[in-house]
């Protein structure tokens, strides 16, 4: 039985983790730092020209297990790493692009750079 005056609504989980954000900062972020109840991430992917582009930021707890699993997507070269062990832990992450498959060369030597 709840004591008088005690709320039955669940207490929202506090945003306890601070992460470095780069190309992926919310509008209210200060000094390229975001806060989350989930994970910090760093991701590398290739743009349309073949350049490697790194982004980093915060992932909310909901759905982040799936997002951090780094499931391969055909014809999309990307890799993601996540962490929760300390504030700004993602500045130490270093995801790398998966190696080229032989068939990636069919369109020419640097099309899938």
């Amino acid at each position: 039985k709840k004591e008088d005056g005690e709320s039955t609504a669940p207490t929202p989980r506090p945003k306890v983790l601070r992460c470095k954000c780069h190309h992926h900062c919310p509008e209210d972020s200060v000094n390229n730092i975001c806060s989350t109840d989930g994970y910090c991430f760093t991701m590398i992917e290739e743009d349309d020209s073949g350049l490697p582009v790194v982004t980093s930021g915060c992932l909310g707890l909901e759905g982040s297990d799936f997002q951090c699993r780094d499931t391969p997507i055909p014809h999309q070269r990307r890799s993601i790493e996540c962490c929760t062990e300390r504030n700004e832990c993602n500045k130490d992450l270093h995801p790398t692009l998966p190696p080229l498959k032989n068939r990636d060369f069919v369109d020419g030597p640097i099309h899938h750079r």
Partner: antibody
Framework: QIQLVQSGPELKKPGETVKISCKAS????????MNWVKQAPGKGLKWMGW????????AYADDFKGRFAFSLETSASTAYLQINNFKNEDTATYFC????????????WGTGTTVSS | SFVMTQTPKFLLVSAGDRVTITCKAS??????VAWYQQKPGQSPKLLIY???NRYTGVPDRFTGSGYGTDFTFTISTVQAEDLAVYFC?????????FGSGTKLEIK
């Protein structure tokens, strides 16, 4: 012998257009990426972007989006940098620089082209 | 974009001295750092790639080391022809960024 030979110095007035060439020899242009790097007088090096020489797709660093354009004439083994609406702050030496497949260090550099106002 | 903080800005050394230049990256770059030499009036030349690999034809007095955020470039025995500006560069993520340079002068 692998070389990147660039066109000669240019003197430009604000508002004019300049087009710099970079002729590759000793290798096949389309098997390596071509990057462009700016060096203002007495300053460091600034990567401007690159062109995927196989697909022809260019990509530009944020500071070089808009007035700058990379292009290719593969039959002549030549890459080009065009600067539109030239500004005084564009005064610099511009280098083309080759990068290997999926590596982003620059193993061969052009001779450099000085553009001044 | 990622910042490469290069120190020192200037080095005045004698022939035969050992020289060390450092670059600190604003984020983990793994091994993705290169070093270049630019002699007066010339184009840059690649010396070191992937932090520690000497490029073809580069004398073995030039070495590089480091991983993550801290990188070091060393000339074990400086020679008169090493008069130049030396730059580090991160080649991990676009836009690729260079250190501000170290000018090496010989006494």
């Amino acid at each position: 012998q692998i070389q990147l030979v660039q066109s000669g110095p240019e003197l430009k007035k604000p508002g004019e257009t300049v087009k710099i060439s970079c002729k590759a020899s000793g290798y096949t242009l389309t098997t390596y990426g071509m990057n462009w790097v700016k060096q203002a007088p007495g300053k460091g090096l600034k990567w401007m972007g690159w062109i995927n020489t196989y697909s022809g797709v260019p990509a530009y660093a944020d500071d070089f989006k808009g007035r700058f354009a990379f292009s290719l004439e593969t039959s002549a083994s030549t890459a080009y940098l065009q600067i539109n609406n030239f500004k005084n702050e564009d005064t610099a030496t511009y280098f083309c620089a080759r990068s290997e497949l999926r590596n982003w260090y620059f193993d061969v550099w052009g001779t450099g082209t000085t553009v001044s106002s | 974009s990622f910042v490469m903080t290069q120190t020192p800005k200037f080095l005045l050394v004698s022939a035969g001295d050992r020289v060390t230049i450092t670059c600190k990256a604003s984020q983990n770059m793994g091994h993705n750092v290169a070093w270049y030499q630019q002699k007066p009036g010339q184009s840059p030349k690649l010396l070191i790639y992937y932090a520690s690999n000497r490029y073809t034809g580069v004398p073995d007095r030039f070495t590089g080391s480091g991983y993550g955020t801290d990188f070091t470039f060393t000339i074990s025995t400086v020679q008169a022809e090493d008069l130049a500006v030396y730059f580090c560069q991160q080649d991990y993520s676009s836009p690729f960024t260079f250190g501000s340079g170290t000018k090496l002068e010989i006494k």
